[in-house]
């Protein structure tokens, strides 16, 4: 039945790009300017998205996709298709309601963007910090003590990442 | 995963130079911390001098003044320059590359001292 309809619906020919104009005996009209269609069929033309504000263009609105947006320098995208821009932080720094706030200690965040997290805690493995953690950087654990005994093999596994945990220092 | 290649050992006499690399394959090797351990027969290994990914270097008491580990990250390896070597230093030498939790060593090279 849907196929049977379809022949007999002049509108299923108009290609993308155009629209099936009622007011023109369901001709395929070309969607006006700042307009565009994805797909065939359509009966109108969506608004093309402006990029305006902390907004900017990344790719041009045309007769057949609409305009994609990113975000000016110094904020980041959010959201599916960009649909918000929030501000870019310093690495070591979150971003808050009141604004970018440096990470508290035992903490880090080594993105512009994005929340600080817990040093990872190298005593959970039974190994000793390597190097110290920063605002921006996460601590470095060593290797295990087992390691580093008389008859330990020349190569090791690498350790699997664990979930970051606070690290006394 | 990055994988870890020592180089450079070798018999060298009291008081001479040697320089020992850590190559690493891997783009993010950049990111990780490089320590260099060393292990003489019967003793455990330990640690030498590490490197941070930002090039903060901290040394052993016994090497301090002696030993200097430095980082290419453009060619992916970190070196030990070992000098004023003592018969003491005679080991295995290993790199070991560290991020977070994970960390990886290399298969070592020997340094022997001796006249």
């Known amino acids: 039945f849907e196929r049977t309809r379809s022949l007999q619906d002049p509108c299923s020919n108009c290609p993308a790009g155009t629209f099936c104009d009622n007011n023109r005996n369901q001709i395929c009209s070309p969607c006006p300017p700042n307009s565009f269609s994805s797909a065939g069929g359509q009966r109108t033309c969506d608004i093309c998205r402006q990029c305006k504000g902390v907004f900017r263009t990344r790719k041009e609105c045309s007769s057949t996709s609409n305009a994609e947006c990113d975000c000016t320098p110094g904020f980041h995208c959010l959201g599916a298709g960009c649909s918000m821009c929030e501000q870019d932080c310093k690495q070591g720094q979150e971003l808050t309601k009141k604004g970018c706030k440096d990470c508290c200690f035992g903490t880090f965040n080594d993105q512009k963007r994005g929340i600080c997290r817990p040093w990872t805690n190298c005593s959970l493995d039974g190994k000793s910090v390597l190097v110290n953690g920063t605002k921006e950087r996460d601590v470095v654990c060593g290797p295990s003590p087992a390691d580093l005994s008389p008859g330990a093999s020349s190569v090791t596994p690498p350790a699997p990442a664990r979930e970051p945990g606070h690290s006394p220092q | 995963a990055v994988q870890l290649v020592e180089s450079g050992g070798g018999l060298v006499q009291p008081g001479g130079s040697v320089r020992l690399s850590c190559a690493a394959s891997g783009s993010i090797f950049s990111s990780y911390a490089v320590a260099w351990y060393r292990q003489a027969p019967g003793k455990p290994r330990e640690l030498v001098a590490v490197?941070?990914?930002?090039?903060?270097?901290r040394y052993a008491d016994s090497v301090k003044g002696r030993f200097t580990i430095s980082r290419d990250n453009a060619k992916n390896t970190v070196y030990l320059q070992m000098n004023s070597l003592k018969p003491e230093d005679t080991a295995v030498y290993y790199c070991f590359g560290g991020r977070s939790s994970m960390g990886t060593w290399g298969q070592g090279t020997q340094v022997t001292v001796s006249s």
């Open positions: 490197i941070s990914s930002e090039g903060t270097t």
